[in-house]
């Protein structure tokens, strides 16, 4: 079949970088400067994608693939291929419509991007705080009051004045 | 396919004044907030100001207020950019944007402005 194919549409035969050009009798011309074609027997090549302004260049154009873009410092990727940039927080912080806010108490982001997020709740899981939650960091559950009880080993044993697995407020 | 050209760019002294435009294609203009931005040698891209997509209401970075004036006219798909008592510190290439200054994207290859003496 793709002999047969071949035979009938000489355009099968223009490699990916290539276009078949109706001007020129149907014989393969590469791509113009600015232009790819990723596939075989392409009729036209395709504008190269342009990194500009909030894009940057991270994969040149070539006969054979479009460029790629990401953001330019102080934004992030958004949408397929990068087709738009949003504005990067800082770490304890979330992206509203007002800009960037600090995320609110027992809400966390450890990133630059995305929202905040709760603490986990250690006691769901029978667990207790070991480490207090921030605004950029989750808590960090520890052992269960019960594995604390005295006689139990523990690396660190609870303050002697502070009933074990509660954490300050 | 979107696009956005800008135009309008060029040399002027301290104290002129300049208007940009920006021509878009390829998408539904009047329904979408619309940017400008800038970028100076070395320096950080950076948003200028935005207009909702009735034009009704205008956000400024603080530096340019009082002094740039961001309007659009949605029956020709352009928006535009009055620049007057420029300084020095504009000298940037400038980028038309649809979207808002925390989430937008560029095509054009932007429009130089120079400001000297």
């Known amino acids: 079949f793709e002999r047969t194919r071949s035979l009938q549409d000489p355009c099968s035969n223009c490699p990916a970088g290539t276009f078949c050009d109706n001007n020129r009798n149907q014989i393969c011309s590469p791509c113009p400067p600015n232009s790819f074609s990723s596939a075989g027997g392409q009729r036209t090549c395709d504008i190269c994608r342009q990194c500009k302004g909030v894009f940057r260049t991270r994969k040149e154009c070539s006969s054979t693939s479009n460029a790629e873009c990401d953001c330019t410092p102080g934004f992030h990727c958004l949408g397929a291929g990068c087709s738009m940039c949003e504005q990067d927080c800082k770490q304890g912080q979330e992206l509203t419509k007002k800009g960037c806010k600090d995320c609110c108490f027992g809400t966390f982001n450890d990133q630059k991007r995305g929202i905040c997020r709760p603490w986990t709740n250690c006691s769901l899981d029978g667990k207790s705080v070991l480490v207090n939650g921030t605004k950029e960091r989750d808590v960090v559950c520890g052992p269960s009051p019960a594995d604390l009880s005295p006689g139990a080993s523990s690396v660190t044993p609870p303050a002697p004045a502070r009933e074990p697995g509660h954490s300050p407020q | 396919q979107v696009q956005l050209q800008e135009s309008g760019g060029g040399w002027v002294q301290p104290g002129g004044s300049l208007r940009l435009s920006c021509a878009a294609s390829?998408?539904?203009?009047?329904?979408?907030?619309m940017s400008w931005a800038r970028q100076a040698p070395g320096e950080r891209f950076e948003w200028i100001s935005s207009?909702?997509?009735?034009?009704?209401?205008?956000s400024y970075l603080p530096s340019v207020k009082g002094r740039f004036t961001i309007s659009r006219d949605n029956a020709k798909n352009t928006m535009f950019l009055q620049m007057d008592n420029l300084t020095p510190e504009d000298t940037a290439v400038y980028f038309c944007?649809?979207?808002?200054?925390?989430?937008?994207?560029?095509s054009g290859p932007g429009t130089q402005v120079t400001v000297s003496s």
């Open positions: 390829g998408f539904a203009f009047r329904d979408f907030t």
């Open positions: 207009i909702n997509p009735s034009g009704g209401s205008q």
């Open positions: 944007a649809r979207g808002t200054r925390y989430k937008m994207s560029t």
